[in-house]
């Protein structure tokens, strides 16, 4: 048996086996955004549903204003995919001006904060330069990837411009973590 | 032993523990698609490599008819990535002729089909307008999340057109589900 | 128990089990990039940092030499994010200048290398054509799947133009793995 | 245009097994699911039991579980339900029921009787 | 097994009238469904996902709640209304109906 180390017949030894069902787990949607105030030079984090829909919690993983919370240490594979849309982006609009072309960007972030630490721990980072010609656009960036994280952390999803959100679907913009 | 209640010491209570070989597991790869019919207002499905290069099925985990068919009940991880490529948008085309620049787009939608429901639920989309100014374009749209599945569900991946689709490749267009 | 065989009252047979917690598993993280010499006709591989702030490998996965060591064999998932920035893409140049519209593009390759094999097997592919009408840009790929492996498989992550990569943040670029 | 068409004997014996089957038309039945629901005299409507046509896999009511066998053939797109060891309870109007993914559509119905 | 428990088993009401039937399960459901079923026919889906309206059916019918409480309403009754109503969960092993309720014109 894998995880029960060789010991006398009579005492039998086990690593801490556990039922994958009761692992925290979360899943969650986008709602629409009611504006808040973010620190200068941090951007905003967006608010999820976590109940209704396609959303969920469990065991002992939990929502509360705007964070995941971690409820036991371990490695977890922590994703998000927002969704922006918006009008034509001042990139061209600055470019066929002839001023300077420093394109528009959409930036998503996940982060973690920990009360033992003072400044928030950027995760996964998605940015990307919108420099679209003519029209409305839309595109998503998707994130993903395991990190070790602490009982007590807790998560968030930053984003550039949170007006330029997708909040119109569960299935455009959403943010889910699971123990492995 | 974590899965183990506490109990007197001649009985041995445990959590329902299970070796994470035998979980449900799939990964599909593009193939040529073949033109089907599918219903008004739906976008079509692709169908999938399930045996052949990387593909395979696992653990009673199905894939049959352009669908995976979910075996057990339980928390599963669902991605698909699929690659797109075009001639160019007519958008930018339209933009030139000095008609309304509404942007083509590029819809990948993961949806699951559930005996209890008579519509298809949309679990995940990713949705990119496609705008390019000249040129032949490509580029993935990548989907991923993790869903409480019943027994018996049926998850399938739906594109907004699937001529754009690039079958050439295994490692470029997928789809993916596993038990955790 | 779910595992544990049928067999007589004093005869107890499981399935191999584990704890969660000893599963091979590795995040790593950009770091500049040493020009090295690659294959004519083979993107070069990217090197990484295993050890410090988000990075880690555990329980006999290792890092070493660009290569990621399977340590045993199983289904595990494999991510990464690439992200690239550069400056006006050759493409709108090009079309500018009445030559052939063939577009520019970025592509991130998940590599699998087995000893017993002569020609790496490409797991996952992003790909996208790169056709800003100016400015700078940046954007990140993002691929992740499940996939068989086995003991003594070297995984690497191979990029089209090295000089293209955001090296400037461990969140931005990354590369994963973990036994499922 | 979507059919279901029930058929089947409209008489059986007591203890024999009952046998009907649903032809399906004008959709693919491994994009759905399928179901029997059955309907006894003056009573309501009774589930009981539904199979998912592309791989075969069956859900029973429990309280039919050990009598009710659903099956699929999808070259003759059709779906069979056997009910064993009928009594003069399991008299009623059978209905053949398309579920998932489409609107649910049911069959007009077929009347079977159980007398010796 | 979910019990669901319809009131009334009949009702009858004047062309025009506001009808509402109630289903009430035994535990907590996420959708509810109902049919509406003529002598001689078989049911016909009216409401799927507790609240909306199956394609074709006229927006004189509606449901609402969620959880244990869920609500059948037509807004203006009309002669081809006459017919059994029933609820149905199609969540828990098995699904089950409500018994019905008959609607009759006065």
């Known amino acids: 048996l894998k995880g029960q180390e060789f010991a006398p017949s009579h005492q039998q030894v086990y690593a801490p086996l556990r039922a994958d069902g009761d692992k925290p787990r979360a899943h969650l949607t986008v709602v629409r955004q009611t504006p808040t105030q973010h620190l200068k030079n941090q951007f905003p984090a967006l608010h999820w549903e976590h109940e209704l829909g396609l959303a969920f919690t469990k065991n002992r993983m939990n929502y509360t204003n705007k964070f995941l919370l971690i409820p036991e240490s371990g490695d977890y594979f922590v994703y998000s995919q927002v969704t922006f849309r918006g009008m034509t982006s001042e990139c061209s609009e600055i470019r066929q001006a002839g001023r300077p072309n420093k394109p528009d960007s959409i930036t998503v972030v996940i982060t973690k904060v920990t009360d033992s630490y003072p400044e928030p721990t950027q995760l996964l980072m998605g940015t990307k330069s919108v420099c679209e010609v003519g029209s409305n656009w839309f595109q998503p960036i998707y994130l993903g990837a395991m990190f070790s994280l602490q009982e007590g952390d807790k998560l968030m999803v930053n984003v550039s411009d949170i007006s330029l959100v997708d909040y119109t679907k569960e299935d455009k913009t959403f943010f889910g973590a699971f123990l492995l | 032993l974590k899965g183990q209640e506490f109990a007197p010491s001649h009985q041995q209570v445990y959590a329902p523990l299970r070796a994470d070989g035998d979980k449900p597991r799939a990964h599909l790869t593009v193939v040529r698609q073949t033109p089907t019919q599918h219903l008004k207002n739906q976008f079509p499905a692709l169908h999938w490599e399930h045996e052949l290069g990387l593909a395979f099925t696992k653990n009673r985990m199905n894939y049959t008819n352009k669908f995976l068919l979910i075996p057990e009940s339980g928390d599963y991880f669902v991605y698909s990535q699929v690659t797109f490529r075009g001639m160019t948008s007519e958008c930018s085309e339209i933009r030139q002729a000095g008609r309304p620049n509404k942007p083509d787009s590029i819809t990948v939608v993961i949806t699951k089909v559930t005996d209890s429901y008579p519509e298809p639920t949309q679990l995940l989309m990713g949705t990119k307008s496609v705008c390019e100014v000249g040129s032949n374009w490509f580029q993935p749209i990548y989907l991923g999340a993790m869903f409480s599945l019943q027994e018996g569900d049926k998850l399938m991946v739906n594109v907004s057109d699937i001529s754009l689709v690039d079958y050439t490749k295994e490692d470029k267009t997928f789809f993916g589900a596993f038990l955790l | 128990l779910k595992g544990q065989e049928f067999a007589p009252s004093h005869q107890q047979v499981y399935a191999p089990l584990r704890a969660d917690g000893d599963k091979p598993r590795a995040h790593l993280t950009v770091v500049r990039q040493t020009p090295t010499q690659h294959l004519k006709n083979q993107f070069p591989a990217l090197h990484w940092e295993h050890e410090l702030g988000l990075a880690f490998t555990k329980n006999r996965m290792n890092y070493t030499n660009k290569f990621l060591l399977i340590p045993e064999s199983g289904d595990y998932f494999v991510y990464s994010q690439v992200t690239f920035r550069g400056m006006t893409s050759e493409c709108s140049e090009i079309r500018q200048a009445g030559r052939p519209n063939k577009p520019d593009s970025i592509t991130v390759v998940i590599t699998k290398v087995t000893d017993s094999y002569p020609e790496p097997t490409q797991l996952l592919m992003g790909t996208k054509s790169v056709c800003e009408v100016g400015s700078n840009w940046f954007q990140p790929i993002y691929l992740g799947a499940m996939f068989s492996l086995q003991e003594g498989d070297k995984l690497m992550v191979n990029v089209s133009d090295i000089s293209l990569v955001d090296y400037t943040k461990e969140d931005k670029t990354f590369f994963g793995a973990f036994l499922l | 245009q979507v059919q279901l068409q029930e058929s089947g004997p409209g008489l059986v014996r007591p203890s024999q097994t009952l046998s009907l089957t649903c032809t399906v038309s004008?959709?693919?039945?491994?994009?759905?699911?399928m179901h029997w629901v059955r309907q006894r005299p003056g009573r309501g409507l009774e589930w009981m039991g539904r199979?998912?046509?592309?791989?075969?896999?069956?859900k029973y009511n429990p309280s039919l579980k050990s009598r009710v066998t659903i099956t699929r053939d999808t070259s003759k797109n059709q779906v069979s339900l056997r009910l064993s060891s009928v009594t003069a309870a399991d008299t009623a109007v059978y209905y053949c029921?398309?579920?998932?993914?489409?609107?649910?559509?049911w069959g007009q119905g077929s009347l079977v009787t159980v007398s010796s | 097994d979910i019990q669901m428990t319809q009131s009334p088993s009949s009702l009858s009401a004047s062309v025009g009238d506001r009808v509402t039937i109630t289903c009430r399960a035994s535990?907590?459901?996420?959708?509810m469904y109902w049919y509406q079923q003529k002598p001689g026919k078989a049911p016909k889906l009216l409401i799927y996902?507790?609240?909306n309206l199956a394609s074709g059916v006229p927006s004189r019918f509606s449901g609402s709640g969620s959880g244990t409480d869920f609500t059948f309403t037509i807004s203006s009754l009309q002669p081809e209304d006459i017919a059994t109503y029933y609820c149905?969960?199609?969540?828990?092993?098995?699904?089950?109906f409500g018994q019905g309720t008959k609607v009759e014109i006065k």
């Open positions: 029921v398309r579920s998932g993914g489409l609107p649910d559509i």
């Open positions: 004008g959709f693919d039945m491994g994009d759905t699911y």
């Open positions: 199979i998912e046509p592309a791989a075969g896999h069956t």
């Open positions: 535990q907590g459901v996420e959708y």
């Open positions: 996902g507790a609240s």
């Open positions: 149905q969960q199609w969540e828990g092993n098995p699904r089950t």
